[in-house]
């Protein structure tokens, strides 16, 4: 139903009106990742807290088994930050040995899975070489953008090395989406 | 009042309709931070420009004394970028002296203060080791996510080292929030 | 027309209601940059994919000649990520030679052009020194914030060195905006 059927005709409304408080939304926060089996040649997916602390899902946006389920077609803003932490990257090891230098790297990918498609779609990727000279390093990768999603799509966050993810605080590593 | 009381019943509206132009919004930009007293064991809060240049507050979102005041309960997208700049990080000093290496770091925290809670809540944190070998370094930390806030909540941006914040340009260091 | 003229008077609506699906939106993705002439003393602008893959423009938001055209005044959230990749930064070269160290840097600027203004306005800047010791490095710069734009404004993304931009994947380097 067009909005103008119940509003003055000069009001620019070309789709059903919709209360903002009713839109699907989620903000998920980090939990400790337990070792699990993941597909070869695919970065492992993170699992998340969806209820406690700052985390929530609302208005039919559900979280299950590492996935955010999209309950309604539309344009969504999707974001994630993953904080990584590690010790003396191999990069410096390799450098010391004088061999050619293929740097360590850390990568975050926000992936969309559509059941009718055989292949997942990478929506966002943040990838960074890590060549810190210090013995300890830590840093975040942040991603965020808008995508047109379909009802039934599933979103997940994949990382290059699950063992480097800082799971200690809910404000350091998180994942969210909301219908615009 | 439910929206469907004045709209056709098959329109999915479960809360009062609301014009987008009327929603609380703010984008604040950096100013030079002068030495001030701040609480021990708490990162200092930045103060901000709220009117000049690109900065604005609107629709009852007010800025006062380093805080953004939330005028209405709801889900907000909150973001900040802080650009830091410094000289030869201690990391290199320590490295030269051959002592074990605790790297310098830069941290940004977006904090929520609720008067009825004794402790502030850290909503977002970006933290990064700085171990640049060069004598000068500069880099941004960006944060952004969605949170459910209550009327009367206050938001601030805290940093690990206020004297490293690049205050020279309004596009380098900023802080904003808007009701979804 | 005030919303309350056709809605119950206690509904807080102070501007015409508006269907969200009708708002101007765009998400643009990277393409290979061909060498072009650009103004001296101004960072070159990137050009973008606006239709294929994840890229789209909708509801009168158009892309033309490196610019996103703003079709309607209002508050927009604007974002971009640029992934850079390079080889041994000069920084390490300079360091080895023992000369004073002015580091390499990578910079992204989101710029607004208003035809009635002689000078472009820099809305967002992400700038980072690059002083990696490894021979290859890669890293993203992410930016996003809200701005009040006018109908007819044009947005572009400028970078410090177009030859360092990673154009290989649409999820690594992108640019978007949407009316709030």
């Amino acid at each position: 139903l067009k909005g103008q059927e119940f509003a003055p005709s000069h009001q620019q409304v070309y789709a059903p009106l919709r209360a903002d408080g009713d839109k699907p939304r989620a903000h998920l926060t980090v939990v400790r990742q337990t070792p699990t089996q993941h597909f070869k040649n695919q970065f492992p997916a993170l699992h998340w807290e969806h209820e406690l602390g700052l985390a929530f899902t609302k208005n039919r946006m559900n979280y299950t088994n590492k996935f955010l389920l999209i309950p309604e077609s539309g344009d969504y803003f999707i974001y994630s930050q993953v904080t990584f932490r590690g010790m003396t990257s191999e990069c410096s090891e390799i450098r010391r040995a004088g061999r050619p230098n293929k740097p360590d790297s850390i990568t975050v990918v926000i992936t969309k899975v559509t059941d009718s498609y055989p292949e997942p779609t990478q929506l966002l990727m943040g990838t960074k070489s890590v060549c810190e000279v210090g013995s300890n390093w830590f840093q975040p990768i942040y991603l965020g953008a808008m995508f047109s999603l379909q009802e039934g799509d599933k979103l997940m966050v994949n990382v290059s090395d699950i063992s480097l993810v800082d799971y200690t605080k809910e404000d350091k590593t998180f994942f969210g989406a909301f219908l615009l | 009042l439910k929206g469907q009381e004045f709209a056709p019943s098959h329109q999915q509206v479960y809360a009062p309709l609301r014009a987008d132009g009327d929603k609380p919004r703010a984008h604040l930009t950096v100013v030079r931070q002068t030495p001030t007293q701040h609480f021990k064991n708490q990162f200092p809060a930045l103060h901000w420009e709220h009117e000049l240049g690109l900065a604005f507050t609107k629709n009852r979102m007010n800025y006062t004394n380093k805080f953004l005041l939330i005028p209405e309960s709801g889900d907000y997208f909150i973001y900040s970028q802080v650009t830091f700049r410094g000289m030869t990080s201690e990391c290199s000093e320590i490295r030269r002296a051959g002592r074990p290496n605790k790297p310098d770091s830069i941290t940004v925290v977006i904090t929520k203060v609720t008067d009825s809670y004794p402790e502030p809540t850290q909503l977002l944190m970006g933290t990064k080791s700085v171990c640049e070998v060069g004598s000068n370094w500069f880099q941004p930390i960006y944060l952004g996510a969605m949170f459910s806030l209550q009327e009367g909540d206050k938001l601030m941006v805290n940093v690990s080292d206020i004297s490293l914040v690049d205050y020279t340009k309004e596009d380098k260091t900023f802080f904003g929030a808007f009701l979804l | 027309l005030k919303g309350q003229e056709f809605a119950p008077s206690h509904q807080q609506v102070y501007a015409p209601l508006r269907a969200d699906g009708d708002k101007p939106r765009a998400h643009l993705t990277v393409v290979r940059q061909t060498p072009t002439q650009h103004f001296k003393n101004q960072f070159p602008a990137l050009h973008w994919e606006h239709e294929l893959g994840l890229a789209f423009t909708k509801n009168r938001m158009n892309y033309t000649n490196k610019f996103l055209l703003i079709p309607e005044s209002g508050d927009y959230f604007i974002y971009s990520q640029v992934t850079f990749r390079g080889m041994t930064s000069e920084c390490s070269e300079i360091r080895r030679a023992g000369r004073p160290n002015k580091p390499d840097s990578i910079t992204v600027v989101i710029t607004k052009v208003t035809d009635s203004y002689p000078e472009p306005t820099q809305l967002l800047m992400g700038t980072k020194s690059v002083c990696e010791v490894g021979s290859n490095w890669f890293q993203p710069i992410y930016l996003g914030a809200m701005f009040s734009l006018q109908e007819g404004d044009k947005l572009m993304v400028n970078v410090s060195d177009i030859s360092l931009v990673d154009y290989t994947k649409e999820d690594k380097t992108f640019f978007g905006a949407f009316l709030l």
């Epitope: - | 030495p35 001030t36 000289m87 201690e90 004598s135 004297s163 | -």
Partner: antibody, heavy 118, light 107 residues
Framework: QVQLVQSGAEVKKPGASVKVSCKAS????????MHWVRQAPGQGLEWMGW????????NYVQKFQGRVTMTRDTSINTAYMELNNLKSDDTAVYYC???????????WGQGTMVTVSS | DIQMTQSPSSVSASVGGRVTITCRAS??????LAWYQQKPGKAPNLLIY???SLQSGVPSRFSGSGSGTDFTLTISSLQPEDFATYYC?????????FGGGTKVEIK
């Protein structure tokens, strides 16, 4: 208000050491860098380096490397600058000043005159 | 190190007059430049930071401009208390360096 109060004038013999103190008040001592700047009689200003009170990290100008030591005592909000192996051309007023690591210095101490003479 | 060259080294001017002091950096320092005023026997006093921003409490007759390598301090209408020595300082890179100073004297 912000105040930096330095120790009194010193007269030293060549080859000796001097340690100048700078007591800070009115701001969070560990939140800002402490710079040391000197000025020889009738001459211009010369930056010597800084200390980061929070961590004790330092950054010295090459010219003074090996001869200068900057320290701090956070329990009494005081920074120190020690210069060893004094020479006659080290005769100067030594200032402490607070600010960013790479920024203008907002607040300065009153200066400490150090005279090196045999 | 970045060299800061100030000119002139001294200038004579009358009360109410206009004085312009220039500072040139040996390499690009963006806008990381400060100006200080120093009176005999006193510590320097910050006037301008980030090339053109007026420090709180400093009279508006002082102004700064420039970016890159060339910078200017202008005193639009000289007052008796403005007779002093002025220094520029770059804060772009290590080590921080000062200009040689400009002495503003009464004509």
């Amino acid at each position: 208000q912000v105040q930096l109060v330095q120790s009194g004038a010193e007269v030293k013999k060549p080859g000796a050491s001097v340690k100048v103190s700078c007591k800070a008040s009115g701001y969070t001592f560990t939140g800002y860098y402490m710079h040391w700047v000197r000025q020889a009689p009738g001459q211009g200003l010369e930056w010597m380096g800084w200390i980061k009170p929070k961590s004790g990290g330092t950054n010295y100008v090459q010219k003074f490397q090996g001869r200068v030591t900057m320290t701090r005592d956070t329990s009494i909000n005081t920074a120190y600058m020690e210069l060893n192996n004094l020479k006659s051309d080290d005769t100067a007023v030594y200032y402490c000043a607070t600010g960013g690591s790479q920024d203008a210095s907002d607040f300065w101490g009153q200066g400490t005159m150090v005279t090196v003479s045999s | 190190d970045i060299q800061m060259t100030q000119s002139p080294s001294s200038v004579s001017a009358s009360v109410g007059g206009r004085v312009t002091i220039t500072c040139r950096a040996s390499q690009d320092i963006s806008i990381w430049l400060a100006w200080y005023q120093q009176k005999p026997g006193k510590a320097p006093n910050l006037l301008i930071y980030a090339a053109s921003s007026l420090q709180s409490g400093v009279p508006s007759r002082f102004s700064g401009s420039g970016s890159g390598t060339d910078f200017t301090l202008t005193i639009s209408s000289l007052q008796p208390e403005d007779f002093a020595t002025y220094y520029c300082q770059q804060a772009d890179s290590f080590p921080l360096t000062f200009g040689g100073g400009t002495k503003v004297e009464i004509k």
